[in-house]
């Protein structure tokens, strides 16, 4: 069976350039080790934004220099991407891999279009 991954179609980043969305997967089995990857698709190019491998019931641990943070609850992962600018507007795909135990499954969401609007600079006050 294919693993279904659901994520919102559209999210608007806040004025500080932070966007959050939920990535939910329908696990065909009882996974204990899961890897979540956020990919950005621009035109036909796909690049990795961040990735974390976690044990079920434990916190997601992204690398120290990652722009992502997240928490997990059951088959849901709450992802937050920080430091976004207007040029980062695009489609962000959630990829979930059930690494252990066998069998391995991979699921890809349809993507979340994240819109980022750079804040207007504050006008000089007299």
């Amino acid at each position: 069976k294919a693993m279904h991954v659901a994520q919102p179609a559209v999210v608007l980043a806040n004025s500080r350039g932070t966007a959050s969305f939920v990535c939910e997967y329908a696990s065909p089995g009882k996974a204990t080790e899961v890897r979540v990857t956020v990919l950005r698709q621009a035109d036909s190019q796909v690049t990795e934004v961040c990735a974390a491998t976690y044990m079920m019931g434990n916190e997601l641990t992204f690398l120290d220099d990652s722009i992502c943070t997240g928490t997990s609850s059951g088959n849901q992962v709450n992802l937050t991407i920080q430091g976004l600018r207007a040029m980062d507007t695009g489609l962000y795909i959630c990829k979930v891999e059930l690494m252990y135990p066998p069998p391995y499954y991979m699921g890809i969401g349809n993507g979340t279009q994240i819109y980022v609007i750079d804040p207007e600079p504050c006008p000089d006050s007299d």
Partner: antibody, heavy 118, light 108 residues
Framework: QVQLVESGGGVVQPGRSLRLSCAAS????????MHWVRQAPGKGLEWVTF????????YYADSVKGRFTISRDNSKNTLYLQMNSLRAEDTAIYYC???????????WGQGTLVTVSS | EIVLTQSPGTLSLSPGERATLSCRAS???????LAWYQQKPGQAPRLLIY???SRATGIPDRFSGSGSGTDFTLTISRLEPEDFAVYYC?????????FGQGTKVEIK
């Protein structure tokens, strides 16, 4: 540019061992899962084995389980396949392949021929 | 294990003709997890189509993929001389990763 170069193939007697290597360059090796795929002479493609990003998770085809071992050295950007108790039916070209971000095998090496014969 | 069956085994066509290759899965394959590869003699396979219908980088638009569930199709709209090769479908959504047995497209 992405490059995968296999080595280590050759002629070996049944029951003996061989270790294949796949040198990767042009990408961040540790960010990708990897596979070995083989092709017997005149036959189709057969998936052999998979290894996860950090090397902790490995999967094998039933035909090689217990005889072949996949491993990787991320510091050397190299993938390995240790083949023990080789049989005539293991004769094939062995390809290493990279898993693309969205799952397909997006880059393949040129292959290395393993011939098991007495 | 998901078994992929390709048909026909061999397709004999002339340059300029349309080629239609079929891949049938023994159980449902999500459309995001079906790929097509081309292999020429003495060469490694080359990714053509992923996600059932997305063309890989550098693949000409005469190649197109379609289908969902258990039935998938690779279409080559107008065969060029360099398209005569063997084509494989593959599912990559779950282990074990499996390939079809291949369809050979030969010159008539």
């Amino acid at each position: 540019q992405v490059q995968l170069v296999e080595s280590g193939g050759g002629v070996v007697q049944p029951g003996r061992s061989l270790r294949l290597s796949c040198a990767a360059s042009g990408f961040t090796f540790s960010h990708y899962t990897m596979h070995w795929v083989r092709q017997a002479p005149g036959k189709g493609l057969e998936w052999v084995t998979f290894i996860s990003y950090d090397g902790n998770n490995k999967y094998y085809a039933d035909s090689v389980k217990g005889r072949f071992t996949i491993s990787r050295d991320n510091s050397k950007n190299t993938l390995y396949l240790q083949m023990n108790s080789l049989r005539a039916e293991d004769t094939a070209i062995y390809y290493c392949a990279r898993t693309g971000w969205l799952g397909p095998f997006d880059y393949w090496g040129q292959g290395t021929l393993v011939t098991v014969s007495s | 294990e998901i078994v992929l069956t390709q048909s026909p085994g061999t397709l004999s066509l002339s340059p300029g003709e349309r080629a239609t290759l079929s891949c049938r899965a023994s159980q449902e394959v999500g459309e995001s997890y079906l790929a097509w590869y081309q292999q020429k003699p003495g060469q490694a396979p080359r990714l053509l189509i992923y996600g059932a219908f997305s063309r890989a980088t550098g693949i000409p638009d005469r190649f197109s993929g379609s289908g969902s569930g258990t039935d998938f199709t690779l279409t080559i709209s107008r065969l060029e001389p360099e398209d005569f090769a063997v084509y494989y479908c593959q599912q990559y959504g779950s282990s074990p990763w499996t390939f079809g047995q291949g369809t050979k497209v030969e010159i008539k």
